[in-house]
């Protein structure tokens, strides 16, 4: 009996035309939503003038439907048993699941000012930047609508730069009509234990953002894992959002719509400093902001973002060192709301429910030559927003799953 089930499972989780896995893999049957909470800065003048703590107040959720587009350019390679694809990006605003509209205004860090002052450290260049910042009446902070902040706006300061630069700025710009990839993953035909594991991303087995093992593309994309998942396993997956591979460990048994699933969570150890977790040494890329690699809970992904000083963390700096959150008032981290988890059906390895949570932060540093940053007396890793991307198997699919998979076993 069990052998027959194993054989059926192995057959049905292969990523090729005609299998259950393939159909749901090409276009997810689950509705996926991405909720945003924006950190609205309450005291912009005091921060700029006196280097005060930044007082933030989160506003949200603002919800978008995402991952509704089918994978594109799906190409099987029979020779190495892989399938390659592009994952198109799309986001549709959901007013009924949001606290306001895309036209809501927020006071946030001026992304262009913070990034330009970080990228161009030369004193003479900073003097030029300063004159352009002044000419455009730009400041350390800015008021932007949700739509502008997420999807892009024409920056008045960058528009004055006398050589060709991208003048459109946005945390997720460009997004709609773009695609993530190319991904090339094992289809599992020759070896089911490799199914969905990424072989290459953008044609490479490494990212070229990190040193050593940190640069590796490990595991799957977290939408599914090879079947017959054990509680003792460490599940590796790659997330292009955070420009790195990461891992999840078993936390608890959960009943999801009558389906027994394993809840895997991202442990605090994954965000620890190299002092606590030596494996993380290669995620520490500089010594000053990281206080000689003793700070933890924030990941400098500037190499992956054309040099812009973007730092990724968990929402509200969950699992981050006190020095990171010390200059920011108004944060309340808690595990239940702010950690990432995956609920995996262990027989098939399918992720039937998930909550991916992350926070986007930007580093801003004092600058002698840039007046709007001149009064700062310390570095700030400024939270801009946090997001919660969730998906849960639908009732109909859950019924089908129960009858065809878990029901057969029980």
């Amino acid at each position: 009996g069990d052998l027959l089930i194993q054989k059926t499972i192995k057959k049905q989780v292969v990523l090729e035309e005609g299998t259950i896995a393939f159909k749901n893999w090409v276009k997810t049957g689950t509705e996926v939503y991405r909720q945003f909470w924006i950190f609205d800065v309450q005291n912009p003048q005091e921060v700029m003038m006196n280097s005060s703590n930044i007082q933030v107040k989160q506003r949200g959720p603002y919800t978008y439907r995402v991952r509704f587009l089918a994978k594109e350019n799906v190409t099987q390679d029979a020779e190495d048993n892989t399938v390659s694809f592009l994952q198109p990006n799309g986001a549709i605003f959901e007013p009924s699941l949001s606290v306001g509209t895309e036209a809501d205004n927020f006071t946030v860090l001026n992304l262009a000012v913070a990034a330009a002052s970080h990228i161009y450290q030369n004193q003479f260049v900073q003097m030029i930047l300063n004159s352009l910042i002044n000419k455009s009446k730009s400041s350390m902070f800015q008021v932007r609508t949700l739509r502008e902040l997420l999807w892009g706006y024409r920056d008045p300061f960058l528009s004055l730069v006398p050589y060709p630069v991208t003048t459109t700025v946005g945390l997720f710009y460009p997004y709609n009509n773009t695609a993530d990839g190319v991904y090339k993953v094992f289809n599992g035909k020759d070896n089911i234990s490799k199914v969905a594991i990424i072989d290459t991303y953008k044609g490479k087995r490494n990212l070229s953002y990190w040193e050593s093992h940190c640069d590796m593309i490990n595991g799957t994309d977290a939408a599914s894992f090879p079947p017959f998942v054990e509680k003792s396993q460490v599940l590796q997956f790659f997330s292009s959002d955070i420009c790195r591979s990461i891992y999840a460990v078993f936390e608890s048994d959960v009943n999801l719509k009558g389906i027994p699933v394993y809840r895997f969570v991202l442990p605090s150890k994954a965000f620890a400093s190299p002092v606590e977790n030596p494996d993380n040494y290669c995620f520490c890329t500089e010594k000053i902001i990281s206080k000689n690699c003793t700070s933890y809970g924030v990941l400098d992904i500037s190499k992956c973002k054309e040099g812009r000083p973007v730092y990724i963390s968990l929402p509200h700096f969950l699992y981050a060192s006190p020095d990171v959150s010390e200059p920011i008032d108004g944060l309340n981290p808690n595990e239940e709301e702010h950690r990432t988890y995956l609920d995996i059906e262990p027989i098939t390895g399918f992720t039937l429910q998930f909550a991916k949570r992350l926070q986007v932060n930007l580093l801003v540093k004092p600058s002698e030559k840039i007046q709007v940053l001149k009064n700062l007396k310390r570095n700030y890793i400024v939270p801009i927003l946090w997001l919660n991307e969730t998906g849960t198997i639908g009732d109909e699919k859950a019924n089908m799953f129960r009858s065809q998979v878990t029901g057969k076993i029980n």
């Epitope: 006071t107 000419k135 009446k137 730009s138 007046q371």
Partner: antibody
């Protein structure tokens, strides 16, 4: 102290052009916008446009495009406005006014104004 | 263009009285740099306008504290707590958030 000294009154014929000047002192001329404002007798104020002397960048009120041309000479710290194809509706007092923005520390709008130049268009 | 509507057109007052002038804009004057560029000027006959209040509520240097400004978004007010003879003239509100900059039509403060 900041001073804006404008050129004297002008009496010009219809269809002609006139160029009025505004000499700045007491601040860094090249890094502050210079605005020009029109006021017809007994009327309100109308913004014509502005120039950034450092690079000659300009913004115009659509209504004055083709009528006014703004220029600046950083070596003499002087801003100029040329008005062309003059008609009676161009008879007015014209003011220059500086607009400083210094990293949020000095940010007052149009804080200092010239004394005004009267332009009379008459045949 | 942003339309600035000032009321009243004329404001007759007795010396020592309080005066209040309203200014309404056709769209929000909140600039992307977090400032609101709404200013108040006083113009006396034969003179150029003089800046009184900048960015809604800040008194320009040398302006007496009997002048105060308030408001946000699209609604703004200038108050003079005790009118003195030297305060008479035409008051203009102005916005420099959006190009082209625009002015209110003016309010003439005169003796009753």
């Amino acid at each position: 102290q900041v001073q804006l000294q404008q050129s004297g009154p002008e009496l010009v014929k219809p269809g002609a052009s006139v160029k009025i000047s505004c000499k700045a002192s007491g601040y860094t001329f090249s890094t502050s916008w210079m605005n020009w404002v029109k006021q017809r007798p007994g009327q309100g104020l109308e913004w014509i446009g502005r120039i950034y002397p450092g690079d000659g960048d300009t913004n115009y009120n659509g209504k004055f495009k083709g009528k006014a041309t703004l220029t600046a000479d950083t070596s003499s710290s002087t801003a100029y406005m040329q008005l062309s194809s003059l008609t009676s509706v161009d008879s007015a007092v014209y003011f220059c006014a500086r607009e400083v923005y210094y990293g949020g520390y000095e940010d007052y709008g149009m804080d200092y104004w010239g004394q005004g130049t009267s332009v009379t268009v008459s045949s | 263009d942003v339309v600035m509507t000032q009321t009243p057109l004329s404001l007759p007052v007795s010396l020592g009285d309080q005066a209040s002038i309203s200014c309404r804009s056709s769209q929000s004057l909140l600039h992307t740099n977090v400032n609101t560029y709404l200013h108040w000027y006083l113009q006396k006959p034969g003179q150029s306008p003089k800046l009184l209040i900048y960015k809604v509520s800040n008194r320009f240097s040398g302006v007496p504290d009997r002048f105060s400004g308030s408001g946000s978004g699209t609604d703004f007010t200038l108050k003079i707590s005790r009118v003195e003879a030297e305060d008479l003239g035409v008051y203009f509100c102005s916005q420099s958030t959006h190009v082209p900059y625009t002015f209110g039509g003016g309010t003439k403060l005169e003796i009753k």
